[in-house]
Structures are given as C-alpha cells and as structure tokens.
Amino acid sequence: MAVTACQGLGFVVSLIGIAGIIAATCMDQWSTQDLYNNPVTAVFNYQGLWRSCVRESSGFTECRGYFTLLGLPAMLQAVRALMIVGIVLGAIGLLVSIFALKCIRIGSMEDSAKANMTLTSGIMFIVSGLCAIAGVSVFANMLVTNFWMSTANMYTGMGGMVQTVQTRYTFGAALFVGWVAGGLTLIGGVMMCIACRGLAPEETNYKAVSYHASGHSVAYKPGGFKASTGFGSNTKNKKIYDGGARTEDEVQSYPSKHDYV
C-alpha cells in the first residue's frame, strides 16, 4: 500500500513539475525590467526564451519573436536546449510511469517489469528536473552578470550632456516557476525510485520437499497462493508461498527471474 502511494504521489508530483517546466519554458517573463532606482518609464520591458515584449502604460503590449537562430547568445541557446531536453525526458518519463503504476493493470505485466519501468521513469524525472534547474540557473547567472555590467555604466552619454538610460533586467516570474517545477520533478523522480525498491520482487526461495517412497522417488512441490490478484492458473514467475512440510534432506532453491540489488 505504501509503495503504491509513494509511486502514485511521485507520479503526481512529477506531473505537476513537468507541467511547470513546460509553462516556464513558454513564459515571456524570464527577465523583467528592473524598476528599482530607475527613472519612471512609461514602458515595461520583459523577455522570454522565444520573444521579448514591451508593455506600455497605454495598455498596448507588443511582442517580437527572436527570428534569428545564429544571432542569439550561446547561453540563451543552451538554456533553450536544457529546457527542451527536460520537457522531452519528462514527457517520456510520464508515459513510462503511467504503465508502471501499480494501480493500473496492463495484461499480465509482472511486478518486476513495473519495477523496471518505475526506476526508468524515476531516473528520467530526476534528469528532467536537473535539466530545468540547470537551465533556469544558467539564465539567472547570465542576468546577474548583465545586471552588474549595466549598473557599472548605468548612464552613457556624450560629454555628460545627453543621457541614455540603460535598461537593466532582473529575475522574472518564469525563473521561480522553473526552479520550483524542476525541484518538484526531481522530488517526484526520487519518490519513483524509492517506490521501485518496494515494487521489486525480493529473492524468493521455492522450497521443495522430497518424499521417499519404496521403489521410486517423487518430488512434491506444494502449490501455494499467488500474490497477484490476477486470474488463471499460470504460476510462472509468481511468488509462491510455502504451504507444505519441509525436510532438511533435499532443499532446492529457485531464484526469481530478476534479482534486484
């Protein structure tokens, strides 16, 4: 029950996280005009990964896409790449984890296969979260560097007669959304990995008892109860509980199909 809850919660947390990463990637407010200690302008500038926008006090907002690929800073391209990789990995992770959910039965899928899939999706979520956090952090670092550079030459002019106000940018809402979303995806991934350990079948011993009769020997293996709620008499790779007597004469051990460390 705890395993199912952990897995389910991990899935939900990751789902929220990936939705947040997608939202952050699409948002225009990665960097916003710094209004502190600045002359009061009637325009507010903000920028995203894909376009920059200007909102005027008139109520008019104008956005322009970055229609160049080669002309963009390498750091911006790197951030875009990290966010997209994070989204793709997260999306694949979600797809895998849906099939891995213990509460969902697909055919006669074994617990060991579900455990494998849970672990895979967990790792994908962790990498996805790390990609998002890295992308947002790289952008934030770029902003901080540019902020102090523009502060150093806040006003540039011709002989001090004419002043040009340099627009400084600070952290936008998308950065915080990205950090939180990346963190959630990471946490969800860790939860999935924890759930995987609970799902994995432990090394099972199938005990056999030999009854020695006169003339010939018959090996008797008691048929126990299936742990699965599935139908049918197919006991292949199912955990079987010992239900018969055992002797120490002849004990056979059958390791499970998949051993998890």
């Epitope: 009637a42 920028q47 920059s52 200007v54 109520g59 106000v165 627009t167």
Partner: antibody, heavy 118, light 113 residues
Framework: EVQLVESGGGLVKPGGSLRLSCAAS????????MSWVRQAPGKGLEWVST????????YYPDSVRGRFTISRDNAKNSLYLQMNSLRAEDTAVYYC???????????WGQGTLVTVSS | DIVMTQSPDSLAVSLGERATINCKSS????????????LTWYQQKPGQPPKLLIY???TRESGVPDRFSGSGSGTDFTLTISSLQAEDVAVYYC?????????FGQGTKLEIK
C-alpha cells in the same frame, strides 16, 4: 466610434475643489490608459495625469502631485480628475484623452474650461 | 524632468514648400526593449483639441496625409511636411512618451508665407 466628453468645469475660488468627469464610449474602456492634458489660455499643452490600462497605476507631474487625483470607474466607462487646493495657475482647458500605441493620444475630448479666480 | 525643446518657435513657409520642425529631448527616448523612440507629434488648430500625427517618432497615424513624416532617434527628432497645404496652418507639438512626466515641447507655430 470613439467618443470622449468632459464635464465638471467652471469657476472656482483659489483653494477650492472641483471634480472633472470624462464619459467614454466606442471602445473597451478598461483596456486603455487614459490621460488628462491641460492648456492655459494662449499657452502650450501640459500633461496633467495618466492612469494606465489594466493595472490602473497613476502618474502625475510635480506641479499637481498631492493636489490632483485621477481615477476611473470601468463599470461606468468614466474617467475622473479630482482637483483640490486649486491655484490661479490651474486655470486652463482640461482635455480627457485616450492613449494607445507609443503611449500617444489619438483620441481627445473637446475640453472643459476650469477658471480659478477670486 | 525631461526637457523637450522645439525649434523654431514659429515658421513661415510658402504653399507647396517643405516645412521642417525640430524637437530635441534632454534624454534619449529610445527604448532598448523594442528599439522604438517614444516621441509623438501633434497638430493643434485654434479652438480645437490636438490631433495625433506621428507616434513612435516615425509611424504615421491612420488618416494622416502622407506629406507628414517623422524621423530621428534618441534625442533628435524632426517633423517634415513635404508640401505645405493651407490646412496645415497650426501649432505643432512634440511630446516625450517615454519618461514620466510626459512633457510637451513649447510648440512651433506654422504659418503661410
């Protein structure tokens, strides 16, 4: 068609108060920034106040800050200018204007005359 | 506050001739975010409210004749009437629409010579 009609002007004594109104029609009032601009007799244009579109931030020049208050009632499609502690130099025709691209003012009312005199 | 200085204060031009009015601001009106200059030109005839001619320094308002054009960037701007018509007699104002307070130039009176 965009229409702006000012009202509330008149004669007032120095130190007195007056409330100007501007009735707007022909556009989605709440979406646009609105301004008051005045023109003293025989003089140039002077910007008095702006209330931005959407978030309704207000802005004033030093000459009127603390004395004038701009406000809007989006439900009534109305813009207001509350003028307190009026001075003789506040005598002017007050225009209500709607802003758009570049914070420019493409639409103006016909103006209302405010005279501050004892 | 931003100071807007227009020149000349008055201008007399013959019909059909070119009229040029200059406007200088004490600070750059260029917004780096969209590379637009927040300068507006208005025309005001006696007894009428001002009429918008040009916004963003060079974008003509719809309905304004194409003989009116705006140019310039940063701190120096120009309004040009390529071929003066009788109905163009008016006072012309430039306005800073970038910094608060939104300041107007003192106006340039355009007359027919």
């Amino acid at each position: 068609e965009v229409q702006l009609v000012e009202s509330g002007g008149g004669l007032v004594k120095p130190g007195g108060s007056l409330r100007l109104s501007c009735a707007a029609s022909g556009f989605t009032f709440s979406s646009y920034g609105m301004s008051w601009v005045r023109q003293a007799p025989g003089k140039g244009l002077e910007w008095v106040s702006t209330i931005s579109g959407g978030d309704s931030y207000t802005y004033y020049p030093d000459s009127v800050r603390g004395r004038f208050t701009i406000s809007r009632d989006n439900a009534k499609n109305s813009l207001y200018l509350q003028m307190n502690s009026l001075r003789a130099e506040d005598t002017a025709v007050y225009y209500c204007a709607r802003s758009y691209n570049g914070n420019s003012l493409p639409y103006w009312g016909q103006g209302t005359l405010v005279t501050v005199s004892s | 506050d931003i100071v807007m200085t227009q020149s000349p204060d008055s201008l007399a031009v013959s019909l059909g001739e070119r009229a040029t009015i200059n406007c200088k601001s004490s600070q750059s009106l260029l917004n780096s975010g969209n590379q637009r200059n927040y300068l507006t030109w208005y025309q005001q005839k006696p007894g009428q409210p001002p009429k918008l001619l040009i916004y963003w320094a060079s974008t003509r308002e719809s309905g304004v004749p194409d003989r009116f054009s705006g140019s310039g960037s940063g701190t120096d701007f120009t309004l040009t009437i390529s071929s003066l018509q009788a109905e163009d007699v008016a006072v012309y104002y430039c306005q800073n629409n970038y910094f608060y307070p939104f300041t107007f130039g003192q106006g340039t009176k355009l007359e027919i010579k």
